[in-house]
């Protein structure tokens, strides 16, 4: 049966919900899937259900709620129906489903190189997603940076931080690294998608070594 896979709000001003629409072998044709929603304004369960306002904008098997349909103050319940029967239902507040867009504009600068010339430290910087209103406190994002050597498969994870820059220590010179960052609303469980990968190529060791003057 169809099931909700995810509801997500990128910025606390809109949200969308997605569902599976797989037809399993041997199951009868369910007919068209519709999404209905109600805002749980009261303790009574008698409120009217309304159909999804926009089945198109968030892609296939989805419902998009623009800012006119979204309020952070009121919990929502949504249900999937087919042939008049409910096949899945869930309730949430918008704050529970915040999953920010990826951080943008990643870049790096060299901090220093070890005396041996084998390791280097860099500072990685990025910007919050454009639609996240950080200044007003409308969103409070924490970030997780991951990095690895290009030929490795396992990413190293750094502790979550609230700033948009972080030093990465002890990278090997002459290696190329991949760096990516993702964010989540503080105290909510869902990280957003990762940023585009930033490639860090540390210059050759010879570029760091200075010939000392001898008098």
């Amino acid at each position: 049966e169809p099931k909700f896979t995810k509801c997500r709000s990128p910025e606390r001003e809109t949200f969308s919900c997605h569902w599976t629409d797989e037809v399993h072998h041997g199951t009868k044709n369910l007919g068209p899937i519709q999404l209905f929603y109600t805002r749980r304004n009261t303790q009574e369960w008698t409120q009217e259900w309304k159909e999804c306002p926009d089945y198109v904008s968030a892609g296939e098997n989805s419902c998009y709620f623009n800012s006119s349909f979204t309020s952070i103050w009121i919990p929502y319940c949504i249900k999937l129906t087919s042939n008049g029967g409910t096949v899945d239902e869930k309730c949430f507040s918008v704050d529970e489903i915040v999953q920010p867009d990826p951080p943008i504009a990643l870049n790096w600068t060299l901090l220093n190189v070890s005396l041996t010339g084998i390791h280097a430290d860099i500072q990685v910087r990025w910007e919050a997603p454009r639609n996240a209103d950080i200044q007003k406190g409308w969103m409070v994002l924490e970030y997780e940076l991951q990095y690895k050597e290009v030929n490795e498969t396992k990413w190293k994870m750094m502790d979550p931080i609230l700033t948009t820059s972080v030093p990465v220590y002890s990278l090997k010179v002459d290696k190329e690294y991949e760096v990516r960052v993702r964010s989540k609303q503080r105290n909510s469980g869902n990280y957003g998608e990762f940023s585009e990968v930033l490639y860090v190529t540390l210059p050759q060791m010879s570029q760091f070594t200075c010939e000392e003057d001898f008098y």
Epitope: S68, W73, I74
Partner: antibody, heavy 125, light 107 residues
Framework: EVQLVESGGGLVQPGGSLRLSCAAS????????IHWVRQAPGKGLEWVAY????????SYADSVKGRFTISADTSKNTAYLQMNSLRAEDTAVYYC???????????FGVGFDYWGQGTLVTVSS | DIQMTQSPSSLSASVGDRVTITCRAS??????VAWYQQKPGKAPKLLIY???SLYSGVPSRFSGSRSGTDFTLTISSLQPEDFATYYC?????????FGQGTKVEIK
Amino acid sequence: EVQLVESGGGLVQPGGSLRLSCAASGFNVSSSSIHWVRQAPGKGLEWVAYISSYYGYTSYADSVKGRFTISADTSKNTAYLQMNSLRAEDTAVYYCARYQSYGGGYWFGVGFDYWGQGTLVTVSS
Amino acid sequence: DIQMTQSPSSLSASVGDRVTITCRASQSVSSAVAWYQQKPGKAPKLLIYSASSLYSGVPSRFSGSRSGTDFTLTISSLQPEDFATYYCQQMWGSLITFGQGTKVEIK
């Protein structure tokens, strides 16, 4: 019993600062949002700011944005309103109020169900 | 910001009268409207939440209704203790707003 008690009001000169406190009992400020609402003498109610301390969300009315800062200390179960660059038009009784949309399996309605008694802030030279 | 236009700003009525106060939202606010009663020198008290639900302990002579973006507070039979100022409030937009208030006075 749910209770909200404001303190910290008083007389302050224009350009000065003041910090208001809203001590909560009977519920956790981390599970609700705390709002500040003010009322100038003889005028209506004006929403000022709110904080959802669990998520760290804050929001401000345009009239106080950049001058007022709302915060909460969940260990003290208290919310604060730091007011800087005060103006004569900030003179008002300041109330804190609770909004709890849902919790404990119950759906609550829209509205501030508990209010403090208010604290008077007078900005005058 | 969403504006809440409340009317009338004041009214005179007698004990036993039916009183109606209205608020019009500048845009759709679903049913995210509350009504409060405030007496001089006191904090506001919640009467109606979510447009039409009576808050616990509030007398049943108070009721709320919604028609689109128009919201109404009705006092079916005014009592002496009901002389006060009444405010509507919307909690739909990210910035919360109140109506200007309606003062209910003794005729």
